[in-house]
């Protein structure tokens, strides 16, 4: 009675192919003959699953990175089968938006390239989709802006699809730096004020970074000795009547408002004295 280890041991995947991430995978450890009889089985990678009985291994919720598995049938000796590749298919992983250019801050007018990166995908054939606020922008791995404007600012996402599924990046915020624009002078309580009261002129603007320096000018283009966003005239005099404009400066540049006219009218007392 010649004793020998199990012969022609094979690891067999019972599932229909392809296997997808998350599937339950059943493998059996088969052999041709053995003397004495097989009493136990071993599996590699070791300890990854509970010890299976009857030469059948069930992997619940198989991971994308479960690559190869091998079994051994054991009597007094263990005979190892050649490893089998699970070849688990999965949706693209680790999708992210990466800015290629410019290197740092995006300034108005810059040409800008965003890249949709992912670490791996199986199968490898993928499609890309770019969206902003739910609107489809493109189907390439790169999203390019020839000349970016402040209106392009917002939240962008890219999606990478393969036959298994699709994966979205985290939303990526595109911010554009630009000089002050859309400046206007607003007047409170209004553009017609009675002498002796107070009038407040406010320089309103849209800028990124915010305006850090304001300059006020009168109808003669004379700069006034005020450098804050609000110009308060109190008490206001008839001589203050005229057109005013403001200039806003941030670290990108300057912007100026159109003229706004303030009319200061005489009070009843002044008219009565005349």
């Amino acid at each position: 009675d010649v004793q020998y280890p199990p012969k022609k041991v094979t690891t067999v995947i019972q599932n229909p192919m392809p296997i997808r991430e998350g599937d339950t995978v059943t493998l059996s450890c088969n052999y041709n003959s053995s003397n004495p009889s097989v009493t136990r089985y071993e599996w590699k990678p070791h300890g990854a699953w509970e010890e299976p009985s009857l030469g059948v291994l069930k992997i619940q919720n198989v991971g994308w990175d479960n690559t190869t598995i091998a079994c051994a049938a054991c009597n007094s000796w263990c005979s190892w089968a050649s490893p089998v590749a699970l070849n688990v298919q999965y949706a693209p992983r680790d999708v992210r938006v990466r800015k290629i250019k410019p290197l740092s801050e995006i300034h108005s007018g810059n040409s800008v390239s965003l890249q949709c990166d992912f670490s791996s995908s199986h199968p490898k054939e993928v499609q890309f989709f770019w969206e902003k606020n739910g609107r489809l922008l493109g189907k390439e791995s790169q999203l390019n802006f020839d000349s970016i404007s402040p209106e392009d600012a917002g939240s962008y996402s890219c999606w990478v699809n393969n036959s298994i599924g699709q994966t979205a990046s985290k939303a990526w915020t595109l911010e554009v730096l630009y000089a002050p624009r859309r400046l206007r002078v607003s007047m409170s309580p209004g553009d017609q004020v009675m002498e002796g009261k107070s009038a407040t002129l406010t320089c309103e603007s849209d800028a990124n970074p915010p305006v850090s320096h304001y300059t006020w000018f009168d109808w003669n283009n004379q700069s006034l000795p005020y450098h804050s966003q609000k110009l308060r005239l109190e008490p206001v005099k008839v001589q203050h009547s005229g057109a005013y404009w403001c200039q806003g400066t941030n670290s990108v540049g300057k912007g100026r408002s159109p003229l706004s006219t303030l009319t200061v009218y005489y009070s009843p007392e002044t008219i009565g004295r005349r």
């Epitope: 290197l103 740092s104 801050e105 007018g109 810059n110 040409s111 941030n250 670290s251 990108v252």
Partner: antibody, heavy 113, light 107 residues
Framework: QVQLKESGPGLVAPSQSLSITCTVS????????VSWVRQPPGKGLEWLGV???????NYHSALISRLSISKDNSKSQVFLKLNSLHTDDTATYYC???????WGQGTTLIVSS | DIKMTQSPSSMNASLGERVTITCKAS??????LSWFQQKPGKSPKILIY???RLIDGVPSRFSGSGSGQDYSLTISSLEYEDMGIYYC?????????FGAGTKLELK
């Protein structure tokens, strides 16, 4: 890839003017700003001004009366002109994209009689 | 103009050491701050912008933090090639201003 190269006179007498050219390759000056920064020998960096893609400029207030920046998009060149030079304008002058994404190697200016 | 006070002005550190350089702005600059590295005889190189965003290709041992007026650059484990002078640049308020620099040398 993006490259910048400054070229200047090297030595200039006090009260004279300085002209430096920055030649840019690898991107369009229609789309990017070019800043000028200087560094006196053994000292730190000082931002001088910038010209943007649309041609608008922004100058350091301390130099606004002496400094002008212009460009020729077709030649991919940016020009710095600094008037009424003093000895403390002696420095290495750099051009850079936007606010420092890419830098030239610098050109050294000595103001001396 | 905004004054950027950078400290220390120079420091000696050992390889593998954690190094922190700080910049304090004379007023709030809203995180509009970059860090540059300059090696002797070379032009500056940008490392970080908007206080904490690492430039692509810059080693992950560099990190930036801060807000308001106070900012810092940290090198988690110093390497030989990190020797040089480091500058902060504020671009939140016109005109742009640099810190005076921190010279980092090997102990």
């Amino acid at each position: 890839q993006v490259q910048l190269k400054e070229s200047g006179p090297g030595l200039v007498a006090p009260s004279q003017s300085l002209s430096i050219t920055c030649t840019v390759s690898g991107l369009s000056l229609n789309n990017y700003g070019v800043s000028w920064v200087r560094q006196p020998p053994g000292k730190g960096l000082e931002w001088l001004g910038v010209i943007w893609g649309d041609g608008s400029t922004n100058y350091h207030s301390a130099l606004i009366s002496r400094l002008s920046i212009s460009k020729d998009n077709s030649k991919s060149q940016v020009f710095l002109k600094l008037n009424s030079l003093h000895t403390d304008d002696t420095a290495t002058y750099y051009c850079a994209i936007n606010w420092g994404d890419y830098w030239g190697q610098g050109t050294t200016l000595i103001v001396s009689s | 103009d905004i004054k950027m006070t950078q400290s220390p002005s120079s420091m000696n550190a050992s390889l593998g050491e954690r190094v922190t350089i700080t910049c304090k702005a004379s007023q709030d600059i809203n995180s509009y701050l970059s860090w540059f590295q300059q090696k002797p005889g070379k032009s500056p190189k940008i490392l970080i912008y908007r206080a904490n965003r690492l430039i692509d290709g810059v080693p992950s041992r560099f990190s930036g933090s801060g807000s308001g007026q106070d900012y810092s650059l940290t090198i988690s484990s110093l390497e030989y090639e990190d020797m040089g002078i480091y500058y902060c640049l504020q671009y939140g308020v016109f005109p742009l201003t640099f810190g005076a620099g921190t010279k980092l040398e090997l102990k």
